[in-house]
C-alpha cells in the first residue's frame, strides 16, 4: 500500500535508469527514525561508523542526515511534456564524506567513505506518503528496501505477495 507494487515490473528499467544531473535538485537535513519512533544513530567506532536503531533518552539529541534529492530519468516509451518517467533518488549522508550504501551481498546497510561521483549503491529510490514518511529502495536491487531487522538497518526484500505497508521499511523524517 505504499507505492511499491509496481517495483518488480520495472526491475530492469530501474537498473538502467540514469541520474539526470550531477547536482542534487534539493537537499534536506533531517533526523531519521523508524515508523515506531526509534532513532537511527551513527557512532564512530574503531575508525569506522556503526549504524544503530535505538530509543533515545528524553533529552538526547537526534543525529541528522543530509538527504540529497536527485532526479532520475526512467527509460520508457512514455511520451509527453517531460513530466513522465522521472523518479526521485536520494543519497543519505550523516557526516561529511560518508554515505549510506547498500551491500546487496550481505543484505546490509553500511556507511562508506567515498568521493563523488557516488556509486550506484549509494542511491535509493524515494517512495513516500508525505515528505515525512518514506521508504528507500535500492537503485542496484529493485524490490529491496532499507529496513529494520534486529535493531539494525538491513536490506529487506519486499515481494508483492507480502503486506506492502510493512512498518519495518517505513521511516520518518523530521527537522527536530
Amino acid at each position: 500500500a505504499f507505492g511499491i507494487s509496481g517495483v518488480q515490473k520495472y526491475t530492469r528499467a530501474l537498473h538502467d535508469s540514469s541520474i539526470t544531473g550531477i547536482s542534487p535538485i534539493t537537499e534536506y537535513l533531517a533526523s531519521l527514525s523508524t515508523y515506531n519512533d526509534q532513532s537511527i544513530t551513527f557512532a564512530l567506532e574503531d575508525e569506522s561508523y556503526e549504524i544503530y536503531v535505538e530509543d533515545l533518552k528524553k533529552d538526547e539529541k537526534k543525529d541528522k542526515v543530509l538527504l540529497s534529492y536527485y532526479e532520475s530519468q526512467h527509460p520508457s516509451n512514455e511520451s509527453g511534456d517531460g513530466v513522465d518517467g522521472k523518479m526521485l533518488m536520494v543519497t543519505l549522508s550523516p557526516t561529511k564524506d560518508f554515505w549510506l550504501h547498500a551491500n546487496n551481498k550481505e543484505h546490509s546497510v553500511e556507511l562508506h567513505k567515498c568521493e563523488k561521483p557516488l556509486p550506484d549503491q549509494a542511491f535509493f529510490v524515494l517512495h513516500n506518503m508525505h515528505s515525512n514518511c518514506v521508504s528507500f529502495e535500492c537503485k542496484t536491487d529493485p524490490g529491496v528496501f532499507i529496513g529494520v531487522k534486529d535493531n539494525h538497518l538491513a536490506l529487506i526484500k519486499v515481494d508483492s505477495s507480502e503486506n506492502l505497508c510493512t512498518e519495518n521499511i517505513l521511516f520518518k523524517l523530521s527537522e527536530t
Epitope: D81, G85, M87, V125
Partner: antibody, heavy 121, light 106 residues
C-alpha cells in the same frame, strides 16, 4: 501525450451524491499518485484528496472527510471521487492531477481541464 | 496545518519589468514548494518545483528561490503571455496552496 479527462460533473441538489471520474492516458498510471483539486468560482485552488499509486493510502481535506471517497482502478487507468452529502460550498471546478514523480507525493506534474460541480436547490 | 500566504494579491507591471511574487509559510517547509500558473479559463500548470527547479518547457525568465518559511517567484522580464494568477503550494506536511497572486499588465 499525457491526458487527464474528468467527467461526472453537473448540477446537483444539496445532500445528494455525485461521482467524478478521471481517465488517464499517455503515462504509466499505476506508478503515480493521483489527486483531486478544486476551485470555487472566482476563487483560489484547494487540494481535496490524494491517493497513492496502488490505492492503499488516501488523504482528504478536513471539510470533505467522511463525505468524499477517492479510489482508483489501475487496470482501467481511472481515478474516482465519490462525493456524498454535497453542500453548496462544494460548488467548484474539480481538477484531476497526476504526481510529478514515480511513487512520490511531491508536486502536481499535469492537470486535467476540470469538471464543474454545482450544488444548488 | 501549514498556512501559505501570498503577497501581493494583485500585481500590475509593465512589459519588460522584473516582477517578484512572495509566498510565506506558517512553518518551515524545507524547500518543498511549487509554483503554478493559471491563465483565465485554463487548468493550472506546474512552473517550478522544489523551490527553484524549472519545469520542462517553461521559459527561463521564470525562477524561484527561498528556504525555511520565505519563498519567491521572479519573472525577470514580464511578457504579455505571463498575465495569469500564480499559486504557491507546499507539500512538506500535507498539501496546501497559497491564495494566489494575480499578475496584470499596466
Amino acid at each position: 501525450e499525457v491526458q487527464l479527462v474528468e467527467t461526472g460533473g453537473g448540477l446537483v441538489q444539496p445532500g445528494r451524491s455525485l461521482k467524478l471520474s478521471c481517465v488517464a492516458s499517455g503515462f504509466t498510471f499505476s506508478n503515480y499518485w493521483m489527486y483531486w483539486i478544486r476551485q470555487a468560482p472566482g476563487m483560489g485552488l484547494e487540494w481535496v484528496s490524494s491517493i497513492n499509486n496502488d490505492g492503499g493510502n488516501t488523504y482528504y481535506l478536513d471539510s470533505v472527510k467522511g463525505r468524499f471517497t477517492i479510489s482508483r482502478n489501475n487496470a482501467e487507468n481511472t481515478v474516482y471521487l465519490q462525493m456524498n452529502s454535497l453542500r453548496s460550498e462544494d460548488t467548484a471546478t474539480y481538477y484531476c492531477a497526476k504526481g510529478h514523480y514515480y511513487y512520490s507525493s511531491y508536486s502536481f506534474g499535469y492537470w486535467g481541464q476540470g469538471t464543474l460541480v454545482t450544488v444548488s436547490s | 496545518d501549514i498556512q501559505m500566504t501570498q503577497s501581493p494579491s494583485v500585481l500590475s507591471a509593465s512589459v519588460g519589468d522584473r516582477v517578484t511574487l512572495s509566498c510565506k509559510a506558517s512553518h518551515n517547509i524545507n524547500k518543498h514548494l511549487d509554483w503554478y500558473q493559471q491563465k483565465v479559463g485554463e487548468a493550472p500548470k506546474l512552473l517550478i518545483y522544489f523551490t527553484n527547479n524549472l519545469q520542462t518547457g517553461i521559459p527561463s525568465r521564470f525562477s524561484g528561490s527561498g528556504s525555511g518559511t520565505d519563498y519567491t517567484l521572479t519573472i525577470s522580464s514580464l511578457q504579455p503571455e505571463d498575465v495569469a494568477t500564480y499559486f504557491c503550494f507546499q507539500y512538506n506536511s500535507g498539501w496546501t496552496f497559497g491564495q494566489g497572486t494575480k499578475v496584470e499588465i499596466k
